[in-house]
Interface confidence: low
């Protein structure tokens, strides 16, 4: 008699390892013999699909080599035209030993940045990922964490984080190890010991000492007044990632010496700098104590400031007075690059006339200092803000003896033009009609930055800057 199909052995969940065989059995009783079809995730499995074997009139479905993508719900449906079709379903769970699909790679990282070492895994059950540093399991802390993905994240990388790492993926079926990778921590160049400033006598030897560290170990170069050091001997030693450089100098002129430590991180460089000044003891003595001679100014820096064919006092306490005084003024002018366009021309005039003082020829050539009033005009009218900042920084110790190089005169110690009109020199291009000062380019507003004192009038009609100066 015809009999509707009945599935006598319902499908069960099947566990299978990758590359192994997995079989589902769907035993059916019916008459006539049923047609049995199979689906995976509701998609019909074709009879001619070579990855499967269907036997026993369709009652056995065998997956010949399981892949991780084979997991899902498998159903068999039996139908013989008598009664309705019947169906039974079961799951295939693909079990897989751990596999590291994205292993970690060697990393170079700068100290303080974040490092991520990847370790992406596959496996069923899902593998747990741990990390080994050197020969020991890595402990997580507030900086070091193993992410959900298995990657290792290290915040604020420290020198001690450098070393050899590998990740370990583990589940109930086995364990997989990545290859060992190297985390290298690089450190920006840093100066540990800065060179010290010295005030020495002419012709003495001085050793400047500069120590720096970094990973890789930095190189140290020395700069003298903005140029590569042209004389002097340099001795270097490296120990425990610290480089020690000593520059020995024979002092014939003052200078600003800069130690520059540089190391390379990929294509980029990191640099640390420290500077020291060498001044000569006689440098700051009052000029009247110094022997010297009168000569026409032949330099370049003060050409636009000093009167044409001006006789200037050259101080023979320096081996080469012209070069020494020119260097001093050159160094000072470099400092003036940062001041306002109002201050700069006036400050330049002041500096040039202070360092290359007007000279009174005679049996004993005598330098003529700047008149106190002219000095005060520059200080209080032209350069009020700059002078305040400079004095404030000096008080707070932000400037070391570099400030001596600026050779800014102390106005209060200069002679007044009221004492003896011939005893002090007037600055060219400045005069004191205070009404016209208001047309002078201001620093921040349309008013002068300070109250203008009652200064003596001069024969000139306006307070101006010579056309020699560029105000741009």
């Amino acid at each position: 008699l015809p009999k509707a199909p009945v599935i006598t052995t319902p499908l069960e969940t099947v566990d299978a390892l990758v590359e192994e065989v997995a079989t589902f059995m769907c035993a059916v009783e019916s008459y006539p013999q049923p047609e049995i079809s199979w689906t995976r995730n509701k998609i019909l499995i074709k009879l001619f699909d070579t990855r499967y074997s269907i036997r026993e009139n369709g009652q056995l479905l065998t997956i010949l080599s399981v892949e991780d993508s084979d997991d899902g719900i498998y159903c068999c449906t039996a139908n013989n035209g008598v009664g309705g079709a019947v169906e039974s379903c079961g799951a295939l769970q693909v079990k897989m030993k751990p596999k590291i699909t994205r292993p970690p790679i060697n990393v170079k990282i700068i100290e303080g940045l974040k490092a991520v070492l990847p370790c992406t895994t596959m496996g069923n059950p899902k593998p747990s990922v741990s990390w080994i540093k050197g020969d020991s399991p890595l402990r997580e802390n507030s900086r070091i964490a193993v992410l959900e993905s298995g990657s290792l994240r290290i915040h604020n990388v420290q020198k001690e984080d450098a070393g050899q790492y590998r990740c370990v993926a583990k589940n109930s079926l086995g364990t997989a190890y990545s290859k060992v990778v190297k985390l290298e921590v690089e450190v920006f160049a840093r100066i540990l010991r800065a060179p010290e400033s010295h005030n020495v006598t002419f012709g003495s030897f001085v050793t400047l000492h500069c120590t720096a560290t970094g990973i890789p170990v930095p190189t140290i170069t020395w700069i003298e007044n903005g140029n590569a050091v042209s004389s002097g001997s340099i001795q270097e030693s490296v120990k425990d990632r610290v480089i020690d450089s000593r520059l020995q100098l024979f002092i014939t002129k003052p200078g600003l010496y800069t130690c520059i430590a540089t190391n390379k991180h990929g294509e980029k460089f990191s640099t640390a700098k420290a500077a020291a000044t060498i001044s000569i003891a006689e440098w700051s003595k009052p000029q009247k104590d110094n022997k010297g001679y009168c000569a026409q100014y032949r330099g370049e820096v003060c050409n636009a400031v000093l009167a044409k064919d001006a006789l200037v006092f050259l101080n023979t306490s320096y081996a080469d007075p012209e070069e020494a005084q020119e260097l001093l003024v050159h160094t000072a002018w470099n400092e003036l690059k940062v001041v306002s366009p109002v201050c700069r021309p006036a400050a330049e005039a002041l500096l040039c006339n202070h360092i290359f003082q007007e000279c009174s020829p005679g049996v004993v050539p005598t330098p003529i200092p700047i008149c106190r009033e002219y000095c005060l005009a520059v200080k209080e009218l032209f350069c009020a803000k700059e002078w305040l900042v400079m004095e404030e920084k000096t008080h707070r110790g932000l400037y070391r003896s570099e400030m001596h190089l600026l050779s800014v005169p102390e106005c209060s110690k200069l002679p007044s033009m009221h004492w003896d009109p011939t005893a002090c020199a007037r600055l060219p291009h400045l005069d004191y009609n205070k009404e016209n000062l208001k047309t002078f380019p201001p620093m921040t507003s349309s008013k002068p930055s300070v109250d203008i004192p009652n200064l003596p009038s001069s024969s000139s009609s306006s307070f101006s800057v010579s056309p020699t100066y560029s105000m741009t």
């Epitope: 140029n227 590569a228 294509e267 460089f269 370049e300 050159h330």
Partner: antibody
């Protein structure tokens, strides 16, 4: 290996525009200074413009100021020279060159690598 | 602008000769002076930087020196491959000027 490759040269009419590119490889534009230098046929070298992209600073020769603009795209590791209002006297081979470090250091290090040059002809 | 006056504009010399090329700055400059060699149809090549430092890979017969505002390139013993045009270059803070060039030819 450090390499600079210029492109974008060609024939242009007076008053026209052209954009030159300088593709860098073997180093990063952001950590160096890039310069454009030109050489008119049979003449000497003339500096045109410089850029230090990490500091965002640029500088130009007086002869091109206001007409040429130098720029850099660090993501493409490429520098550019946009040339507007071109004149017959701008006809030259244009080289890009690099120097180590920022604008203050670069003068001391010299232009250590140069491209092969690209010819710009301004003619009606 | 600082001018770099290069002399001579051309010279003829024989292999083995000592050759000196001078650049004079129109005003005081730093030691940010470089020397380049250029052959026809080629890009310039750096020889000397910072006035006297020899660039890597450049033969030691090339040297640079400074005396005040005068900068000198010396080739101690001229070789066949040295026949080329030589340029000096000064760099302020990116106010850069080249000398007009010196062509070194075979005598």
């Amino acid at each position: 290996e450090v390499q600079l490759v210029e492109s974008g040269g060609g024939l242009v009419q007076p008053g026209g525009s052209l954009r030159l590119s300088c593709a860098a490889s073997g180093f990063t534009v952001s950590s160096s200074s890039i310069h454009w230098v030109r050489q008119a046929p049979g003449k000497g070298l003339e500096w045109v413009a410089s850029i230090s992209s990490s500091y965002g600073s640029t500088s130009y020769a007086d002869s091109v100021k206001g007409r040429f603009t130098i720029s850099a795209d660090t993501s493409k590791n490429t520098a550019y020279l946009q040339m507007n209002s071109l004149r017959a006297e701008d006809t030259a081979v244009y080289y890009c060159a690099r120097s180590e470090g920022d604008r203050y250091v670069s003068g001391y290090s010299g232009f250590d690598y140069w491209g092969q040059g690209t010819l710009v002809t301004v003619s009606s | 602008d600082i001018q770099m006056t290069q002399s001579p504009s051309s010279l003829s010399a024989s292999v083995g000769d000592r050759v000196t090329i001078t650049c004079r700055a129109s005003q005081s400059v730093s030691s940010a002076v470089a020397w380049y060699q250029q052959k026809p149809g080629k890009a310039p090549k750096l020889l000397i930087y910072s006035a006297s430092s020899l660039y890597s890979g450049v033969p030691s017969r090339f040297s640079g020196s400074r005396s005040g505002t005068d900068f000198t390139l010396t080739i101690s013993s001229l070789q066949p491959e040295d026949f080329a045009t030589y340029y000096c270059q000064q760099s302020g803070v990116w106010l850069i000027t080249f000398g007009q060039g010196t062509k070194v030819e075979i005598k």
